[in-house]
Interface confidence: low
């Protein structure tokens, strides 16, 4: 093809010419190309009008092209270019007009390009620029040059992993002249020692990220004090898991936050044996979203303080016991992957709508009712990947629930009453791998709105699927894989008029019967892979519903013998539905073992007597 | 397939081969070398990724003396405010990082362990690299 050796991803639009040892821009790519990846080619030098042949370009990736020189007007013809990526080029000479002509540029990535200063970076005319990423460079001064006043659309400025040590009032002067309130600034991994008090006074940012910046608690403390007067929608403070510098910190370290206006706060990877959460976070009592990730927390009773948080996130923290949570305004609580505190204790969260308690190894002595969570507003509840959850109430007071996830927790008493009877609004239910043994036909009674039911990895009495789905008239997705099923009631799916996806894989069915599926007018996907299907269990195989588009019968134990000729022929007739048909292989007889079923030519003659 | 030696410890010998076509060079150092009976140390990685590292996860396929364990998925980078600094690494950017590790040992039987590490990243998801580690375990060696 004309574009070779490049790869045509989307004809006339997207071409990938990565790592092809090109020394110059290829000339066999269509004029109409919009996305061009030339990364990892030794281009070394970009002269004027280098891309004249690609006037429609919107995305140009020049990562690691060993580019040392970019001349005036190198991109002059690219008036539609919105993204230019220069990552990993050892640029030594950048002409003043290097980026001229880029009248639509929105994203400029100049990561690891030997950039030593923003002052000499010739981008002042790029008025459309929304994102400037100059991370992993040699920039020492945080002074935002005067030309920034032209960049009125700037939303993201990434200066992480540079060499910035000091931030002075004059550095941010230009921001006072700009109507930016949407700017996100990332200064992580700069060795910041000093922020002059007042430097951020009356500046508004959307997000400020300061992670692994300080190698000393006192420096961190004085720098936070130096942020006084800043108004920021989201502040992210802390360290990276692989870039740890700070010792155990104390409450005085964060006192400077009292002088900031913050809407959302996140603290990550700091070792603080928090003795008193109120003292530590009293400056953050009024933020709307509060997040702690990988922080050691000891005394936890203080979460009952009058914090006005609407979203609380506690992830991978260490607790001694499950915290007492009494937060009147809280709407969302994410409490996941925490250590310690193995028994759930009641919380009082009257405004709560979203609760994620997954991956904590928690045990619940009684689940679930309004009294457990102190709310009647709950819509989302995730209790997955926990320990033993004993079902003792059928969600009284939690009738608003729409999403319920128990997967990989150990559910007890599931077959003693209709556990979900109250949940008329539930749309999503996952009880996969919960050690549930279905021995009660009313298990799913009440789930009138349910659309998705995942129950893989459980078991049924006598390995028989009974009529348990009677109420699920709105179900569209049903996963019954890995349930050790051997048989099913012919009327098991009778009421599932809206069912589109049915997964019966990884069970112990020995024969295939189309009868139970004839009443599924919306069925599109039926997965019977990884069973032991040898044949059909009746001579007259019906047709599957006409809606069926995908039938997976791979990895079964097909018997490729004369007595099953009609079944094998029927399979061939379904060829247009079959998924990965080449993986449907004969298991018996031994001389045909491993042969693809569809390639068989079985000609059977009557035995002569 | 060329084997790249990583290290030897008192109870293990570790090497790897590439299990993808590309075989983009990756440098791995472990100090001190992993002991299967339990150890802690530093893993140093030097790598230039051929795609953005964001939303990185590993598929782990572990084989113990030819017996395959179920696939494990380990999410490393979720996409924003990530745990590790290298999660923000872009295609073509040098990743030169040290990650501490520690694990309490479990008793492993003597033999050969294979661990295929498929690194998947980006959006749309594609393979970043694939390494097949060979770990020869000699529990009683000194």
């Amino acid at each position: 093809e004309s574009w070779e050796p490049c790869v045509e991803v989307v004809p006339n639009i997207t071409y990938q010419c990565m790592e092809l040892k090109f020394y110059k821009i290829p000339d066999n790519i269509p004029f109409s190309t919009k996305n061009l990846d030339l990364s990892f080619n030794p281009l070394r030098h970009l002269g004027s009008y280098s891309f004249l042949r690609f006037p429609e370009l919107q995305v140009l990736d020049l990562s690691r092209c060993e580019i040392q020189t970019i001349e005036d007007g190198a991109y002059q013809s690219l008036s539609h270019l919105s993204t230019l990526i220069l990552t990993g080029n050892p640029i030594q000479s950048l002409a003043l007009g290097a980026f001229s002509g880029l009248s639509s540029l929105q994203k400029l990535v100049a990561v690891e390009t030997n950039l030593a200063s923003l002052e000499n970076f010739p981008i002042g005319h790029l008025k459309t620029l929304k994102e400037l990423n100059v991370a992993h460079n040699l920039i020492q001064s945080f002074k935002l040059p005067e030309y920034f006043s032209n960049l009125t659309n700037l939303e993201h400025l990434d200066l992480s992993s540079n060499k910035i040590q000091n931030i002075y009032c004059k550095d941010l002067q230009v921001l006072h002249q700009m109507p930016l309130s949407n700017l996100s600034l990332d200064l992580s991994l700069n060795p910041i020692n000093f922020i002059q008090p007042g430097a951020f006074k009356e500046i508004r940012l959307h997000k400020l990220t300061l992670r692994s910046n300080f190698d000393d608690l006192n420096v961190m403390k004085t720098c936070i004090q130096g942020l006084a007067g800043l108004e920021v929608h989201r502040l992210v403070l802390g360290e990276f898991r692989n870039e740890r510098n700070l010792e155990e910190f104390d409450k005085s370290s964060l006192e400077g936050l009292c002088n900031l206006t913050i809407e959302e706060f996140r603290l990550t990877y700091l070792d603080c044996y928090l003795d008193n959460i109120i003292d530590l976070f009293n400056c953050l009592a009024n933020v709307s979203s509060f997040s702690l990730v990988s922080v050691n927390i000891k005394r936890v009773e203080d979460f009952s303080y009058n914090f006005r948080w609407q979203h609380l996130e506690l992830v991978n923290c260490k607790f001694e016991q499950f915290p007492t949570l009494e937060l009147k305004s809280l709407k969302r609580l994410t409490f996941t992957a925490n250590k310690g505190g193995n028994a759930f204790s009641e919380v009082d969260l009257p405004s709560l709508e979203f609760l994620d308690l997954s991956r904590n190894g928690l045990s619940f002595k009684g689940c679930c009712s309004q009294s457990d969570f102190g709310t009647t507003s709950l819509k989302y509840l995730d209790l997955s990947f926990n320990d033993v959850i004993t079902m003792s109430s059928n969600f009284l007071g939690l009738e608003q629930l729409e999403h319920l996830d128990f997967q990989h927790s150990n559910l007890k008493q599931m077959s003693q009453f209709s556990v979900f009877l109250s949940l008329r609004n539930l749309i999503y239910l996952d009880i996969s791998h919960t050690h549930t043994r279905v021995a009660f036909n009313g298990i799913f009674d009440g789930l009138l709105s349910l659309k998705v039911l995942k129950m893989a990895g459980n078991s049924f009495q006598e390995n028989f699927l009974p009529d348990i789905f009677t109420d699920l008239k709105n179900l569209t997705f049903l996963d019954l894989s890995q349930c050790q099923l051997e048989q099913l009631s012919p009327t098991a799916f009778d009421t599932l008029n809206k069912l589109q996806v049915l997964n019966m894989s990884h069970n112990n069915f020995f024969s295939l019967d189309t009868f139970p599926y004839k009443c599924l007018p919306s069925l599109q996907v039926l997965d019977y892979s990884l069973n032991h299907i040898m044949t059909s269990n009746n001579q007259e195989l019906q047709h599957f519903p006409s809606s069926l588009a995908f039938l997976n019968l791979t990895q079964n134990d097909f018997a490729c013998t004369c007595e099953h000729q009609s079944f094998l022929q029927w399979i061939k007739d379904q060829r247009q539905l079959l998924v990965e048909a080449e993986r449907m292989e004969c298991a018996t007889p031994s001389d045909k073992q491993g042969m693809p079923v569809l390639s068989l030519n079985i000609t059977c003659q009557m035995n002569k007597t | 397939q060329k084997h790249y030696w990583v290290c030897n410890s008192s109870d293990a010998s570790i090497s790897y081969t590439y299990c993808d076509k590309m075989q983009y060079p990756i440098s791995i150092n472990v100090n001190p070398c992993i002991k299967l009976k339990g150890s802690r140390g530093l893993l140093h990685i030097f790598y230039i990724p051929r795609r953005d590292v964001k939303q990185l996860y590993f598929n782990l396929y572990i084989t113990v003396n030819s017996m395959t364990l179920p696939k494990r998925k380990e999410v490393i980078c979720r996409g924003s405010d990530d745990d590790y600094s290298f999660c923000r690494a872009l295609k073509g950017e040098t990743v030169n990082t040290t990650v501490s590790f520690s694990f309490k040992g479990i008793k492993f039987s003597k033999g050969k362990y294979k661990c295929v590490v498929e690194a998947i990243s980006g959006s749309p998801e594609e393979m970043l690299f694939c390494l097949e580690f060979d770990i020869i375990h000699q529990p009683n060696s000194n």
Partner: antibody
């Protein structure tokens, strides 16, 4: 309200080991904070000796490191100080205290005088 | 270790008078400095934390200031019950250290 109470012999012979216990009420010593020993020779200033963290970790004043042990008995909710090879200069009022989160000491026992003399 | 030097060692003051005690650290300790009051035969009592933050229940005549290496404890209008020895303590790093103390006596 947390309360701390030191106890132990008021007289110890030179070269012997001084042993004191601090009984804590109103808060579990494994529930948080760190638990410290401070001493004050008669008519002199205060000297910090060391602590045991709620996790069991200990740290000591380098000047005493070779002679000091701090341990705990969680079942009795108390922690103890042992100072070996004592001499007359170890004569002091010994205080136990609880550290707050800024390495400050808001809660102290009332102190117990230990005299080293033969 | 960080050495704290307190001055004066001793002060004799008349009631209602202002008392100023200084504490100097051998290296910068930010504001990780706390003040204690100790009356005869009593254990020390925390007065001021982080150089200038009053502890609840402590009379408002006690105040603190300073940052870095130089700190001051001020008793604005001395009362008879304030007769005691006052100690500064740094919490910047272990080992924790105390100043030598300032004894305040009522004339």
């Amino acid at each position: 309200q947390v309360q701390l109470q030191e106890s132990g012999p008021g007289l110890v012979k030179p070269s012997d080991t001084l042993s004191l216990t601090c009984a804590v009420s109103g808060y579990s010593i494994t529930g948080g904070y760190s638990w410290h020993w401070i001493r004050q020779p008669p008519g002199k200033g205060l000297e910090w000796m060391g602590y045991i963290h709620y996790s069991g970790y200990t740290d000591f004043n380098p000047s005493l490191k070779t002679r000091i042990t701090i341990s705990r008995d969680t079942s009795k909710n108390q922690f103890s100080l042992k100072l070996s090879s004592v001499t007359a200069v170890d004569t002091a009022v010994y205080y136990c205290a609880r550290k707050d989160s800024g390495r400050l000491l808001p809660y102290w026992g009332q102190g117990t005088l230990v005299t080293v003399s033969s | 270790e960080i050495v704290l030097t307190q001055s004066p060692d001793f002060q004799s003051v008349t009631p209602k008078e202002k008392v100023t005690i200084t504490c100097r650290a051998s290296q910068s300790i930010s504001d990780h400095l706390h003040w204690y009051q100790q009356k005869p035969d009593q254990s020390p009592k925390l007065l001021i934390k982080y150089a200038s933050h009053a502890i609840s229940g402590v009379p408002s005549r006690f105040s603190g200031s300073g940052s870095g290496t130089d700190f001051t404890l001020t008793i604005n209008s001395l009362e008879a019950e304030d007769a005691a020895t006052y100690y500064c303590q740094q919490g910047h790093s272990f080992p924790l250290t105390f100043g030598g103390g300032t004894k305040v006596e009522i004339k």
